[in-house]
Interface confidence: low
């Protein structure tokens, strides 16, 4: 990965000597924890006949507040610690004079990373030990000698998960406009296997590369109004915790099984990504579970296939895209990738070819917005604890933090006239700048629909006239009848639907007798269960990729290779008339309800999945007894 002569792996490059622009003479006093690397820095690079001025700011949101590192100590014990003084040297920014430019670089030992100008992606890295003023190579990704990499997620596995693939719905959105919804946050946990550790040689080198990779991934996702925040890094410096196979589907299965076992004693995170030094079979460099973000299967495996970390960053962004419901671009008829150069591919192209992609296609964005409408995506709505973001509040990072009224990103990216991007305060006369109940810088009136009902287990939400955000997504009361089942936390789980999700359109629930088997380790069947709430038993369809199965008679149960984990019938699944699976047993519907909740809603609302009143348009919580207008009049109109 880091040979002594890095340029030996480049076909064509230009030597540049970056020049750091002097900072302002008077600097505000910085808190001592901000360390050696300045908050903002600018460099001039003479490359491809141009002088590029890069304006960079430290990515203060790279690490979550509870960021941990896990490794094996010399005595063989596993150690998890929260590193103190988390100063770092990872920056993001733009190129002066280029409106749609982007930059993501580390300045730790010279400049390393990428900057994008128009349709050109330039990579930069040091050629010697001369630091930031020393000789650097600037080159384009197609001049990096490497083999093309492909994604292992097959079209077959995508089909059943993503639904029909027509592009009539994909309307290109202007390149400079972010989706108008709230920012979403992926709290990321990265695992680095022993092969990668051996390749890089030390914990410090691994940490540096991972932070560089996540910094790049975060920059790529900011175009979608997403932030990617690293909450944990695990380095297998002694030995692998599970078998990392050259078969990426096996490795992914092992990662997800291991993650499920670790969940109780490791970070709560939205997504886990393995970076491996193992060479996957064939040209595959990544593999992911599709539409799995926020579920127990939210993860992917990535081969560190390129000398430049931008390579594995693009792979990780691609596999995370699958986790977020995106299909390969070439599978979608009429999919538009705005890349303008000849070999232009977007991030969700099935193969990365000879150049690194730098943007998401229109159809990727449409898939993403569709995924965000699902109840399961709720884990992305919660920002990491903003009171503790490493480095304290920083204006211009898309996080609305302590002391800020709004944050639309750095001035060069901000397109929000309701927010002053340099102060992160509301523009004069503005009541709000963000949120679905904010229109033209004003809070929408009470009772206006802000989140329509998605299906029969959902409830619609209305603006309350006071807050710019739409109220939290709420669902029909658990136990409300829905097609073939009973609503549970916004879903309508049935055996048939679960079997289809795993086994594809031909999947269906197995015979009732199958459910009297429990599968014990080693695929041994134990006929003792008296209900249908044990192992999910299916028939028909296609065996899911990367899953082992236990077969008893005509009953098919999904399991892991060692038989220690099997796919359960999910909580809330109908197991009989007026009965649902709850705590692994078939129980009466009344387990959902402690009291007659709806009676407390004064006929102006219904009970939701949290056993709280969900008021009709214009009525005020908690009991829908008063009109919102009355409540506001009594307490002043705005917060």
């Amino acid at each position: 990965i880091a040979p002594s002569r890095p340029w030996a792996l480049m076909e064509q490059y230009e030597v540049v000597l970056p020049w750091r622009l002097p900072g302002p003479r008077v600097r505000r006093a910085l808190p001592s924890h901000l360390g050696l690397h300045p908050e903002r820095v600018s460099y001039v690079l003479g490359a491809t006949g141009h002088n590029f001025t890069l304006h960079l700011r430290k990515n203060r949101d790279l690490l979550g507040s509870g960021y941990t590192e896990t490794y094996t100590a010399a005595n063989g014990s596993e150690v998890t610690e929260q590193p103190r003084g988390q100063d770092h040297c990872f920056y993001q920014g733009h190129v002066e004079g280029y409106p749609d430019s982007a930059a993501s670089l580390s300045t730790c030992a010279g400049l390393r990373g990428f900057f994008q100008v128009g349709s050109d992606l330039h990579l930069i890295e040091p050629l010697d030990e001369g630091g930031e003023g020393g000789r650097h190579a600037v080159y384009q990704a197609e001049h990096l000698l490497q083999t093309a990499g492909t994604c292992g997620v097959s079209d077959d596995s995508l089909g059943s998960l993503l639904g029909p693939r027509t592009a009539a719905v994909f309307r290109p959105r202007p390149g400079d406009s972010l989706p108008s919804r709230e920012t979403r946050y992926v709290e990321l946990y990265v695992v680095v296997d022993n092969a990668e550790f051996q390749m890089l040689g030390s914990e410090a080198a691994v940490r540096h590369r991972v932070l560089e990779v996540v910094n790049h991934v975060d920059k790529l996702y900011q175009k979608l109004n997403f932030r990617v925040v690293l909450v944990g890094l695990e380095i297998w410096n002694s030995q692998d915790r599970f078998h990392v196979s050259p078969d990426p589907s096996v490795t992914l299965e092992n990662l997800l099984t291991w993650q499920a076992r670790q969940r109780t004693r490791r970070h709560l995170h939205d997504n886990v990504q393995l970076i491996t030094g193992v060479d996957f079979t064939g040209t595959t460099v990544g593999f992911a579970r599709v539409s799995a973000m926020c579920s127990h299967s939210s993860g992917a495996v990535n081969q560190d296939h390129s000398k430049n970390p931008v390579g594995v960053a693009c792979t990780m962004a691609h596999e995370m895209g699958h986790n977020l419901g995106m299909d390969h671009d070439e599978n979608v008829q009429g999919c538009r990738c705005q890349e303008r150069f000849e070999a232009g591919r977007c991030i969700m192209a099935g193969s990365i070819g000879s150049s690194f992609p730098r943007m998401f296609s229109d159809c990727s964005q449409a898939y993403l917005e569709s995924f965000l409408e699902r109840p399961q995506s709720v884990c992305l709505a919660n920002a990491p604890d903003l009171s503790h973001l490493v480095g304290g509040p920083v204006c211009g990072n898309l996080f609305v933090e302590r002391g800020e009224q709004c944050d639309c990103g750095p001035p060069e990216d901000c397109r929000n006239r309701c927010c002053n991007s340099t102060t992160c305060q509301l523009a004069e006369g503005a009541q709000c700048a963000h949120g679905t109940c904010c229109q033209e810088c004003k809070v929408k009136p009470a009772g206006e629909l802000c989140r329509p009902k998605k299906d029969m287990c959902d409830l619609e939400e209305f603006c309350d006239g006071r807050h710019p955000e739409c109220p939290e997504d709420a669902f029909q009361e658990n136990g409300t009848p829905c097609s073939g089942g009973y609503c549970y936390n916004g879903a309508c789980p049935t055996l048939a639907q679960q079997c289809q999700a795993f086994w594809g359109p031909g999947g269906q629930a197995a015979e009732e007798s199958c459910f009297s088997y429990d599968i014990l380790p080693g695929c041994k069947a134990s006929r003792y269960r008296a209900d249908m709430c044990g192992v999910l038993q299916c028939k028909g369809g296609q065996q899911p990729l990367g899953r082992a199965i236990c077969i008893v008679d005509v009953c098919h149960a999904l399991t892991t290779e060692d038989g220690t984990a099997y796919e359960p019938v999910p909580e809330g699944t109908r197991c009989g008339p007026e009965k649902v699976c709850w705590k692994g047993r078939c129980q009466d519907l009344h387990v959902y309800r402690s009291s007659n909740c709806s009676a407390q809603c004064h006929n102006h609302g219904v009970c939701n999945h949290k056993q709280e009143c969900h008021c009709h348009a214009g009525w005020a919580p908690p009991h829908c007894a008063k009109l919102l207008t009355e409540v506001h009049a009594a307490s002043g109109s705005l917060p």
Epitope: A260, R261, S526, V535, T564, A565, R585
Partner: nanobody
Framework: EVQLVESGGGLVQAGASLKLSCAAS????????MGWFRRAPGKGRESVAT????????YYMDSVKGRFTITRDNAKNTVYLQMNNLKPEDTAVYYC????????????WGQGTQVTVSS
Amino acid sequence: EVQLVESGGGLVQAGASLKLSCAASGRTYDIRVMGWFRRAPGKGRESVATTTWRDNITYYMDSVKGRFTITRDNAKNTVYLQMNNLKPEDTAVYYCAAQTEDSAQYIYWGQGTQVTVSS
């Protein structure tokens, strides 16, 4: 959360016996299945023996049938593995694991206890 602590491992001669104990604490009322697993040097983890907490349905891997017995004492929240006629190939780290009512996976694991059988 459920905490699991194993004890009883050690070094013995081939043909000897050992009894491993696994004491569970915390939300033990959630436990549905408990089991013993082992990992020998250079090998993957194997499921040795498991028992359902309520109705005592047991499972043994073929190579230990007739030699190992899994029992439990619900009052003490402890599961035992009686290992007789031990063989050198039984040498491994033995782990206790628990599966809860609302999970289909062994999500709680002990730290492991070393069993070494010399010939």
